[in-house]
C-alpha cells in the first residue's frame, strides 16, 4: 500500500486519497470534483518565443 508522499505517481497522474491509488489527470476534464485533481497541474504553457519588432 502506497504512503502518500513516498513514491510519486507517474507523469500525468495524481494520488487519490479517496481511492488509494494514482489516477489519470485526463479524467479531471470530465469530472473536476475528484480529490486527485487538486494534484494535477494545468497544461504546460506554450514555449516562450521572442517577438522581434
Amino acid at each position: 500500500e502506497r504512503v502518500p508522499g513516498t513514491t510519486p505517481c507517474p507523469r500525468g497522474s495524481s494520488w487519490s486519497a479517496d481511492l488509494d491509488k494514482c489516477m489519470d489527470c485526463a479524467s479531471c476534464r470530465a469530472r473536476p470534483h475528484s480529490d486527485f485533481c487538486l494534484g494535477c497541474t494545468a497544461a504546460p504553457p506554450a514555449p516562450f518565443r521572442l517577438l522581434w519588432p
Epitope: E1, A17, D18, L19, D20, A30, R31, H33, S34, D35
Partner: antibody, heavy 120, light 108 residues
C-alpha cells in the same frame, strides 16, 4: 459469491448510540471503497458515508456529520458505522454497499440492510 | 449539491409494455448516472452504470441512455419480476453521491 451482511441495528432512545457492522465475504475486501446508505420507512435512498479502501479517507452527509463515524478493519473484512447522538430522523434501514473496482462510480453489491429505530 | 429528479413518481403498466423512466440532474453530470432496482424489503440492485452500461447478469430488456442533465431508463417489454421501485444515482460528485426520489412501477 459476494456477500455483505449488516448487523447491529435495533431500538435505541434519542441521544443514544449504536454501532453497525457489515461483514464482507466472497471477495477481497481491502481494495474496495465502501459506503453506507439509509432508507427511512416508505422513503427513498440517502447516502450517509464513504470510506476509502485503506480507511484513510472518509466523507459524510451533512445530516450525520459530527455524529456518525465510518471505519473499516481490512484484516476482519468488516465495515463499521458508529452512530452517536441519534435522532428520530435517523430511523431507517441502513445498507452497506461496495464501490466499483476502478472508481466509485457505482455500487455493485449491497447488504440486506439492518433496521435502526430511534424512539423513546 | 446536485439534485436528481425522477419522473413519473409512479406508473401503472401491464406485462409486455414498454416502460420509460426519466431522471433529470440539476446541473450537467456528463454520463455519471446509475440506475438501481429495489423490491419491497430487499436491497437495491445495480442495473445500469455510467448511463448506458448494462451490469453483468441484468436482462437485456433494460437499457439506459442520456448525458448531461437528462437520462432515461427503458424496459423494452415489462416482465412480472420488473414491478419494483427504480432509482437513479449521480456519481459526478463522487464520493458525495445523490439519488433520485424513486419511480414505483405497479401492475395495471
Amino acid at each position: 459469491e459476494v456477500q455483505l451482511l449488516e448487523s447491529g441495528g435495533g431500538l435505541v432512545q434519542p441521544g443514544g448510540s449504536l454501532r453497525l457492522s457489515c461483514a464482507a465475504s466472497g471477495f477481497t475486501f481491502s481494495p474496495y471503497p465502501m459506503i453506507w446508505v439509509r432508507q427511512a420507512p416508505g422513503k427513498g435512498l440517502e447516502w450517509v458515508s464513504y470510506i476509502s479502501p485503506s480507511g484513510g479517507s472518509t466523507h459524510y452527509a451533512d445530516s450525520v456529520k459530527g455524529r456518525f463515524t465510518i471505519s473499516r478493519d481490512n484484516s476482519k473484512n468488516t465495515l463499521y458505522l458508529q452512530m452517536n447522538s441519534l435522532r428520530a430522523e435517523d430511523t431507517a434501514v441502513y445498507y452497506c454497499a461496495r464501490g466499483g473496482d476502478t472508481y466509485f462510480d457505482y455500487f455493485d453489491y449491497w447488504g440486506q440492510g439492518t433496521l435502526v429505530t430511534v424512539s423513546s | 449539491d446536485i439534485q436528481m429528479t425522477q419522473s413519473p413518481s409512479s406508473l401503472s403498466a401491464s406485462v409486455g409494455d414498454r416502460v420509460t423512466i426519466t431522471c433529470r440532474a440539476s446541473q450537467s453530470i456528463s454520463g455519471y448516472l446509475n440506475w438501481y432496482q429495489q423490491k419491497p424489503g430487499k436491497a437495491p440492485k445495480l442495473l445500469i452504470y455510467q448511463a448506458s452500461s448494462l451490469q453483468s447478469g441484468v436482462p437485456s430488456r433494460f437499457s439506459g441512455s442520456g448525458s448531461g442533465t437528462d437520462f432515461t431508463l427503458t424496459i423494452s417489454s415489462l416482465q412480472p419480476e420488473d414491478f419494483a421501485t427504480y432509482y437513479c444515482q449521480q456519481s459526478y460528485t463522487s464520493p458525495f453521491i445523490t439519488f433520485g426520489q424513486g419511480t414505483k412501477v405497479e401492475i395495471k
